[in-house]
Interface confidence: medium
């Protein structure tokens, strides 16, 4: 489970932490669980790790962040940021999204109460 | 639009289980990300937050109910259900279902049980 | 648990007044304050959020303010449809907890 709460920091602090971490692993995680089997998404080689091993890493790094509402949604917003432009119709975002939204739960974290996904100047 | 209703008894004996439903209309429960709540607010007094459900199942209970309390969901009927056992009069109370994270909590207009004999 | 205290329990006020409540909180929640407006009957409705962001098609007239212990919300300039009761809401920390209420009422 993850650590207490810690004293949720100005957004700057989150922002820096959020550029430490290595979202990559929850990127692959989400695209592996909405793509499936498909090959058609060749950005990352989404077979060569199995999607619990991408998902136990993506939760390591979110670990490492402060365990505050803030952060977290900062994470789930730059996730969403890093995968805008390979994701290749509403539908598809609306899937990124979903499993986005799950991923806090999925690590045992607690979800933001408001965190707005509608990121990227409404490309996504 | 999201609309959340509860449905009970109006009266529950004391000893006996107090069981609310809350049925979700306007989207579906097992989307992922929300949590599916309990409140309650006793007669005349504050509002005493029970705890959630959420989609898959997973749980989290006011340590003060925990011994007695559990909540479930169907996502066959859209429903997430709360059960409280061993009542008392202290638990007559207007019995919210609520929607929270991500956006706006939606709340139900709540329904009044009362334990009485 | 973290505690919410609210005041004042009741408030009586003119349409057109300007009226403050306030939550404090017995450890710091940061800004994870909602405010609400309730009316018998009826679902309890959020105006304001992360202490001071007011909820989408919320009038301009409800304000909230505060960070840490310390919150505020105000309605400037009272208007008939605004009598209900109000309460704040922590969720920086589980079990979320509710202030008291205050019933606000017409002089």
């Known amino acids: 489970m993850r650590r207490e709460r810690g004293r949720q920091g100005d957004s700057s602090s989150c922002e820096r932490q959020v550029d430490r971490v290595n979202l990559k692993p929850c990127e692959q995680h989400i695209m592996q669980r909405i793509m499936g089997e498909q090959e058609q998404y060749d950005s990352y080689d989404i077979r060569s790790t199995r999607s619990s091993d991408q998902q136990q890493r993506c939760c390591d790094e979110l670990n490492e962040m402060e365990n505050t509402q803030r952060c977290m949604c900062e994470a789930l917003q730059q996730i969403m940021e890093n995968q805008c432009d390979r994701l290749q119709d509403r539908q598809m975002v609306q899937q990124f999204k979903r499993e986005l939204m799950n991923l806090p739960q999925q690590c045992n974290f607690r979800a933001p109460q408001r965190c707005d996904l509608d990121v990227s100047g409404g490309r996504c | 639009q999201v609309q959340l209703q509860e449905a009970g008894p109006r009266l529950v004996k004391p000893s006996q289980t107090l069981s609310v439903t809350c049925t979700v209309s306007g989207a579906s429960i097992t989307i992922g990300g929300y949590y599916w709540s309990w409140i309650r607010q006793h007669p005349g007094k504050g509002l005493e937050w029970m705890g959630y459900i959420y989609s898959n199942g997973r749980t989290y209970y006011n340590p003060s109910l925990k011994s007695r309390i559990a909540m479930s969901i169907d996502t066959s009927k859209n429903q997430f259900s709360l059960k409280l056992t061993s009542v008392t009069a202290a638990d007559t109370a207007i019995y919210f279902c609520?929607?929270?994270?991500?956006?706006?909590?939606?709340w139900g207009q709540g329904t009044l049980i009362t334990v009485s004999s | 648990d973290i505690q919410m205290t609210q005041s004042p329990s009741s408030l009586s006020a003119s349409v057109g007044d300007r009226v403050t409540i306030t939550c404090q909180a017995n450890q710091d929640i940061v800004n994870s304050l909602n405010w609400f407006q309730h009316k018998p009957g009826t679902a309890p409705k959020v105006l304001i959020y992360d202490a001071s962001k007011l909820e989408t098609g919320v009038p301009s007239r409800f304000s909230g303010s505060g960070s840490g212990t310390h919150f505020t919300f105000t309605i400037s300039g009272l208007q008939p449809e605004d009598f209900a009761t109000y309460f704040c809401q922590q969720y920086e920390n589980l079990p979320h907890t509710f202030g008291q209420g205050t019933k606000l009422e017409i002089r």
């Open positions: 609520a929607r929270e994270a991500w956006e706006t909590p939606l």
